[in-house]
Amino acid sequence: AGVFELQIHSFGPGPGGAPRSPYSARGPCRLFFRVCLKPGLSEEAAESPCALGAALSARGPVYTEQPEAPAPDLPLPNGLLQVPFRDAWPGTFSLIIETWREELGDQIGGPAWSLLARVTRRRRLAAGGPWAGDIQRAGAWELRFSYRARCELPAVGTACTRLCRPRSASRCGPGLRPCAPLEDECEAPPVCRAGCSLEHGFCEQPGECRCLEGWTGPLCMVPVSTSSCLGLRGPSSTTTGCLVPGPGPCDGNPCANGGSCSETPGSFECTCPRGFYGLRCEVSGVTCADGPCFNGGLCVGGADPDSAYICHCPPGFQGSNCEKRVDRCSLQPCRNGGLCLDLGHALRCRCRAGFAGPRCEHDLNDCAGRACANGGTCVEGGGAHRCSCALGFGGRDCRERADPCAARPCAHGGRCYAHFSGLVCACAPGYMGARCEFPVHPDGVSALPAAPPGLRPGDPQRYP
């Protein structure tokens, strides 16, 4: 167990970066940082949690940007970022530092956050060592920071895996340094063979002297690369104490992408060219030259391997790499049950019967906004509408001039005459009524219950 500590020293425009803040003045804002740690030897998904831990800084002081003034180093939060780790410190790890800006203006729903810069580095670091300093560029921004890993007692060692507990036997296992630097906190280790190297030897039983990797000899004083056996490498021979010939760690150059190999005790180290990282320089940064933005997205930043890129997506696309088409139909823009079709360049609504308009917003079966011409009146009913037309007009919207006599409305041979307000039936002898529908009985009495006064059989009957 232990703690990874990160100290941010400054964040501002880098040399040759934008002389003014690339972010226009939008009122007061403040910075905060997020750190994420992942074991460096396992290529984990970015979507997976930060396996070694993560931490969020406090918010920095409020800062109001001046659009015309050169952007200074921005005011930072106080204190360290601390990421506790529970298990062993892996030695090689990925460090991801994100710089976030919090806008404090009058945003609906509270503050708005935007990611200003993101740096990802793979680093080699032993726990208990001194602070390591670093300067990273992300687009026009420059981030200066230091970091270290330290064990928390009772854990000790470069990986924080050895436990030094009072009142217990303190044994330093293979490959780990003895407890000498922390003897005050630890029980006395077993007494090793006299003269056994405190730095490179250890013992589990009194009187023995076992060597850490990279060291040999009876007292573990001889580095493997300069042993008395003519520089031959390999496991110790039990008979001679010499090394059996074996390949050197740099043989065949394990460093990829033009990295140069240098031997370390029992291992090797790669010095990587710019833009490459990892134990064997096998990992490279991603820049705008990689074409990381899809669907016409514009890549900014990321001009060199040490800076992050950001994709600005065109309308209709989203995602960190503009790889996702925005499902504009998910907003249900088509009203009244219309079917939404995203054609890419445009949105189309296929309307249900009775509806029209770009978004099916017009109800054709609705008298609201529906005009019946020539004095007709709109009548709703049964989910539809119709126009009741004034006399002399017909058609769906009462726009057609009607011949009132076309339908032969006068019964029993009555003659029809068009009239300005309708039609008039001139009935044949023996019939009467508006449409000559009633026969007149021989006694001169109509079949009508009562004839309107002043109406005689054979008179023309006006149809109102």
Partner: nanobody, 117 residues
Framework: EVQLVESGGGLVQPGGSLTLSCAAS????????MGWHRQAPGKQRELVAN???????NYADSVKGRFTISRDNAKNSVYLQMNSLRAEDTAVYYC???????????WGQGTLVTVSS
């Protein structure tokens, strides 16, 4: 760590076709980009085509309409079908893999494509 193995390079006549394949192994995870870059003698390495695991693609203007990139996510593989090849397509073609949201990627060793009569 991700390992990339390319195949399919070789000598082809102008106007001919060739298909490059690249298989990724190791810790490949869902959201990633696989693609092809090329480096002609004396020139800088340039993007030819790439493809997001979600299906989006990019092509260099010089190869649009002639080259087609495709991938098989289940096999962690990417393919480049090269048609109507020209002498200027002669280069070492490198497979490229990188994870989304993690600005770290890997290169293959490269496979030589020579277009010559």
């Amino acid at each position: 760590e991700v390992q990339l193995v390319e195949s399919g390079g070789g000598l082809v006549q102008p106007g001919g076709s060739l298909t490059l394949s690249c298989a990724a192994s190791g810790s490949t995870f869902t959201s990633n980009v696989m693609g092809w870059h090329r480096q002609a003698p004396g020139k800088q390495r340039e993007l030819v085509a790439n493809m997001h695991s979600g299906g989006s693609t990019n092509y260099a203007d010089s190869v649009k309409g002639r080259f087609t990139i495709s991938r098989d996510n289940a096999k962690n593989s990417v393919y480049l079908q090269m048609n109507s090849l020209r002498a200027e397509d002669t280069a070492v073609y490198y497979c490229r893999w990188y994870g989304i949201q993690r600005a770290e990627g890997y290169w293959g060793q490269g496979t030589l494509v020579t277009v010559s009569s």
